[in-house]
């Protein structure tokens, strides 16, 4: 794991809203050179969010993670302020970056120094969402849509950076947004291009100008405070790539905003999740549109374009 960089590689202009510490496995401060101080939180789904270090919930979360890390260390764990399982994912994961986040890969091509260090299984999962986020989501409308992969944490709005890929060179790209009325804003996530001489497994792709998305897809996270509890399930487009910074996530009670995810996960032998309409309860989430990403490995750029999918919003009553 390479950490030797003082240059600011994660810039946060927008902070996430609250996330249960049960869903967090790790945190780190951004570099002093970034100017605006922020805490980078990693969820059990290996999604990264910017958080304001002055907020009490962030202080409490860090303290909690410190205690867990200390307990793990006493038990022979080797985590760096990281709790929870960090094992290769067998299901597609989606990661996103906040509209206000700028990732600048280090010279090694790493998008950030948040690559998890695998350890014992029990120490490897802390989140309790849902593997990463809750698995079944229920909202005030009572419908449960098809679930999204575990690798997706429900997260605050507009503050997710990207998903840290646990030991894999395959990337799964998916855009996702909260079930919330009204258009979802998508902001550009800018990163500097990584040198073309780097090893493919450590290349960092840059996310470029995603188009604004009116009905961004849900990732299965509950839109905090909205009262919806869908169990959505998005089909993911897989691309052979290394770790990739992604777009912003927006969650209602985790903060309003727009969200686009670009996730990096191991290629699953199970393939993409089926988009089976399965909902129950009485929550009725809004329609979703999956975002498909196209990648040019030569440019290491990622263009995310919305592709409407009529199936995505299917509900089971």
């Amino acid at each position: 794991q390479h950490h030797g960089v003082t240059k600011c590689n994660i810039t946060c202009s927008k902070m996430t809203s609250k996330i249960p510490v049960a869903l967090l496995i790790h945190y780190q401060q951004n570099q002093a050179s970034c100017g605006k101080r922020a805490i980078i939180l990693e969820t059990r789904q290996h999604r990264l969010f910017c958080a304001d270090p002055k907020e009490q919930w962030v202080k409490d979360a860090m303290q909690h993670l410190d205690r867990q890390a200390a307990a793990l260390t006493r038990n022979g764990g080797t985590f760096e302020k990281q709790i929870g399982e960090v094992k290769p994912r067998t299901t597609p994961a989606a990661g996103g970056m906040d509209e206000s986040v700028v990732l600048e890969p280090e010279a090694t091509g790493e998008s950030s120094s948040l690559e998890p260090t695998p350890s014992s299984q029990e120490a490897q999962r802390a989140l309790g969402t849902s593997p990463e986020l809750p698995t079944g989501v229920t909202g005030s409308s009572g419908t449960r849509l098809p679930p999204t992969p575990k690798a997706q944490d429900g997260g605050p709005v507009g503050t997710e950076l990207f998903r840290v890929p646990p030991v894999s060179t395959a990337a799964t790209w998916q855009s996702s947004a909260p079930h919330q009325p009204g258009p979802s804003l998508w902001a550009e996530a800018k990163t500097s291009e990584a040198p073309s001489t780097q090893d493919p497994s450590t290349q960092a792709s840059t996310a470029s100008s995603p188009a604004p998305e009116e009905n961004a897809p849900s990732e299965g996270q509950r839109v905090w405070g909205q009262g919806q509890s869908p169990r959505p399930e998005n089909s993911l487009e897989r691309e052979e790539m290394g770790p990739v910074p992604a777009h912003t996530d927006a969650f209602q009670d985790w903060g309003p905003g727009s969200m686009a995810h670009v996730s990096v996960v191991p290629v699953s032998s199970e393939g993409t999740p089926s988009r089976e309409p399965v909902a129950s309860g009485s929550w009725t989430p809004k329609a979703e549109e999956p975002i498909h990403a196209t990648m040019d490995p030569q440019r290491l750029g990622v263009l995310i374009t919305p592709v409407p999918d009529a199936q995505a919003a299917t509900r089971r009553q």
Partner: antibody, heavy 119, light 107 residues
Amino acid sequence: QVQLQQSGPELVKPGASVKMSCKASGYTFTNYYIHWVKQRPGQGLEWIGWIYPGDGSPKFNERFKGKTTLTADKSSNTAYMLLSSLTSEDSAIYFCATGPTDGDYFDYWGQGTTLTVSS
Amino acid sequence: DIQMTQSPASLSASVGETVTITCRASGNIHNFLAWYQQKQGKSPQFLVYNEKTLADGVPSRFSGSGSGTQYSLKINSLQPEDFGIYFCQQFWSTPYTFGGGTKLEIK
């Protein structure tokens, strides 16, 4: 419609083990956590732990470590909880439940499996 | 671990009355609180999450509030179907913990 169907009541002797099941339907089983909750007669609820069927990884309440084994069978959409070295303290109703991925609260519950440990 | 203390342990009320159940956490749970209702011999039913957001199908006479360590569930104009046991649950940190329950009985 999301449903969690649990196995029937169990009467076992102290020291024995028991394995109860929770069959999920109405949603993609591998995408959501399954939690287990214990309720002793006339008492409150205790969270035992969860399993993520997608990769089989569990997390436990420390109080139940060593006592409990959580597994999941993706082919049958079924989660299992094995309780070992049973004592009368383990006599309770055990619920499986599932929740969203943005926070571990439980929007769907099984009907419960009653375990009676008695010689 | 965060302990959840519910009060009162039981209360009697008449149909049409308003009651309030409180839940105190031993630490700040940052509004990550859920409420459930359980009827005799049944599994718990999900009512509220994130301290105040009603689950689907839950009547508007139910309302949640609170912050930090103190939370409450208020039921206006009690209906016959509202009687049962109510539990709070924090999902800020693991292990997730529940309150001891409040038994709401018909007077």
